[in-house]
Interface confidence: low
């Protein structure tokens, strides 16, 4: 038979509610979404969890839940509560979680919250709260999580927070707060997470974050800040900082000097024009740094002490040179994007042994020296498009065994070194108008995509089947030797008979196709024939 206590459990389940034991001889009661307009009356004294969410409860009477001394979680979210009277939660000595979100409260129910000494989590989000009385949280000594987001607050309730020394996480996001005064969170020494995103914050007191000794996450995204939040300097444990989508125009020197633990900084979608050269120094945990369009930056940042950076993006600035020691500071760099700058001369990147991707397109680079990219054993992608490169040392790419993508389009090349590039799958040379010679497919056994300056240069890559048949001109009077075209078929162009020529061409195509199928552009056609095929020499 069942014990008297389990009998009490069974009898304590209100009509239509769902009840089940919680494994500790206590009862979980779910009365959510039942259209209730008042609290059920026959609740078991042994109830530990009570969910009354999504009902039509518009008021609570004083002491509506008598004797529920074991109740740990009470959910009243999604009702029509506009006011909670004194004594509404009297006797709930074990209450740890109270959910009042999605109601119509206009201020924090101060008297109702008094003496909930065990309360750890309080949800007041998605109400209409515009006022937080100074003493409203004074008895909540155990409170760890507080939700006040999505309300109508216009200022930080500084006094109300004074008593919350155990608070670990708080969100004030999605309110109408416009300023954070000095010492706004002065006593919140245990706070780890603070969300202030989606407010109207335009100014911060210089000491507004003083006292937040444990803060690890600060979210100021989507506000109206027009100055860098220098008040963060006191946040020595800060790991994640967001201030994207504001109106900040500059990041000062030594901006994060007080935040050596930063792992993540989100600051995109700001009109940042200037960044102090020392702004990102001494951030050993920072892995990614992205800064696009800061047009007033003329010098590469000094990243001393930020040695674990794995990805650096600094585009659309006016950087004209890089320090020779750039890789000494950044030994762990995997991705480097310095596109859309004014770089002319490049240092040797060989100390950046972990580099996998380099993007230097749209700069002013004119030469690639032998040591520029030496021994970058992990480099897979190199983009040098839209520069002024006229000279590439013959061995510039000779020690890049992992390189599969190389983009040299829109430069001033008249020749192209092939040494070390046998692993390429993607090669772009389009827009180099002085590069008129042919490139042999034999040198690129892995090639899948190639873009050349001229259509006829694609003929070496087996994409000419239609072109041969359509144009079929082949400079019939041309006496150029074909030795370099295909050793096996050397001399076969001596045949003047058109059928022999066609047979040769078909054989030639089949041989190329057997090697591999390559997508080459611009593809030859009736208006871009292969008639120049004999004008140049294949590069061996």
């Amino acid at each position: 038979g069942s014990s008297p206590r389990s009998g009490v459990l069974l009898r304590g389940c209100p009509t239509h509610c769902h009840c089940e034991p919680d494994g500790r001889m206590l009862l979980r009661v779910d009365c959510s979404d039942l259209g209730l307009s008042e609290l059920p009356s026959n609740l078991s004294v042994f109830t530990s969890y009570l969910d009354l969410s999504m009902n039509n409860i518009s008021q609570l009477l004083p002491n509506p839940l008598p004797s529920l001394r074991f109740l740990e979680e009470l959910r009243l979210a999604g009702n029509a509560l506009t006011y909670i009277p004194k004594g509404a939660f009297t006797g709930l000595y074990s209450l740890k979680v109270l959910m009042l979100q999605n109601n119509q409260l206009r201020h924090v129910p101060t008297e109702a919250l008094q003496n909930l000494r065990s309360l750890q989590s309080l949800r007041l989000d998605a109400n209409h709260i515009s006022y937080v009385p100074p003493s409203c949280f004074s008895g909540l000594h155990s409170l760890r999580h507080l939700w006040l987001d999505d309300n109508a607050l216009t200022e930080i309730p500084v006094q109300a927070f004074r008593s919350l020394s155990a608070l670990q996480a708080m969100t004030l996001a999605l309110n109408k707060i416009h300023h954070i005064p000095d010492y706004a969170f002065g006593n919140l020494s245990s706070l780890v997470v603070l969300h202030l995103h989606n407010n109207r914050i335009h100014s911060l007191g210089k000491k507004c974050f003083d006292g937040l000794h444990s803060l690890e996450t600060l979210d100021l995204n989507y506000n109206n800040l027009d100055e860098f939040p220098t008040a963060i300097r006191t946040l020595s444990n800060l790991k994640e900082l967001g201030f994207h989508s504001n109106n900040i125009r500059s990041i000062p020197e030594k901006a994060f000097v007080g935040n050596p633990s930063l792992i993540t900084i989100h600051f995109y979608d700001n009109p940042i024009q200037f960044v102090g050269r020392s702004a990102f120094q001494h951030l050993p945990e920072l892995r990614t740094l992205t800064l696009n369009g800061a047009s007033q930056i003329t010098e590469f940042p000094d990243l001393t002490g930020t040695a674990n950076l794995e990805s650096l993006t600094l585009t659309g600035a006016q950087i004209s040179s890089l320090p020779q020691t750039v890789c000494n500071q950044l030994p762990n760099l995997q991705v480097l994007d310095l596109s859309y700058n004014l770089l002319e001369d490049l240092p040797s990147f060989s100390v950046c042994q972990k580099l996998q991707k380099i993007d230097l397109r749209h700069n002013e680079i004119y030469e690639i020296k032998v040591d520029t990219f030496q021994q970058l054993l992990s480099l897979r992608s190199l983009n040098l498009a839209w520069n002024k490169i006229a000279i590439i040392h013959p061995n510039a790419f000779s020690t890049l065994p992992s390189l599969i993508k190389l983009d040299l389009s829109s430069n001033l090349l008249s020749s192209f070194p092939i040494t070390g590039l046998h692993g390429l799958t993607h090669l772009k040379l389009t827009g180099n108008h002085a590069l008129q010679s042919l490139i042999s497919s034999e040198n690129f056994p892995e090639l899948k995509v190639i873009e050349m300056p001229y259509a006829y240069q694609c003929c070496a890559f087996g994409v000419c089947e239609n072109a041969y048949k359509i144009s079929n001109q082949w400079n019939k009077g041309d006496n150029s030797s074909m030795d370099d075209l295909h050793k096996k078929d050397a001399g076969m162009f001596q045949a003047q008979d058109e059928r022999d020529l066609e047979d040769f061409l078909l054989d030639f195509e089949e041989d190329l196709k057997a090697l591999h199928s390559v997508q080459c552009s611009p593809s030859p056609g009736p208006f871009k024939p292969c008639e120049h095929l004999l004008d140049g020499w294949l590069i061996r």
Epitope: N198, T217, H266
Partner: antibody
Amino acid sequence: QVQLVQSGAEVKKPGSSVKVSCKASGRTFSNYAIGWVRQAPGQGLEWMGGIRPNFGWAKYAQKFQGRVTITADESTSTAYMELSSLRSEDTAVYYCARYGQGHFPSAFDYWGQGTLVTVSS
Amino acid sequence: DIALTQPASVSGSPGQSITISCTGTNSDVGTYNYVHWYQQHPGKAPKLMIYDGSNRPSGVSNRFSGSKSGNTASLTISGLQAEDEADYYCQAYDSHSFNIVFGGGTKLTVL
């Protein structure tokens, strides 16, 4: 590259519970919220809730309040979604996804491969 | 109960442009920039195409663009290609219910 790998397909009886796991690769698990979205056969996407692992906050869609529990284990970079009192209309593919900017209103930039849960007697 | 309204289907020929609308209320689409668009091919997980109204994640073609006017967000795909054929979903944040809401989805057919 972030990857979210979910547990395998499940067949459950009405009234029972199912717990789906979602293991994240990469070091930033704690700094991003993980959400759960489901999709019934031939239907659209439906948000169930989400959790911010570094301090255990969970938010749930009103429809699932009380029936869904979302948890996270920082030590294994794994999030869990448990749905109780299953009924036949809970048959769906359940996806976990990462909130790209950390907080709950932001977009899901990485998704798990999905877990098919079939509720049938 | 779908909170955001999308057309059930749209179609276009290769090379054309199409626009998919997503209509909500003042508390979701109308209030914040938290409108996101996803593409989903049959049997696959959704893929983020546009976030925060108009931003494109890296790797997403610039043929995809997003915009918002009042309570309606829009996804425009220009230069339609065969691989664009898929279901498209909008997503928004509802400041009233504090929930994330999806549109019912739009099936795009490339003729």
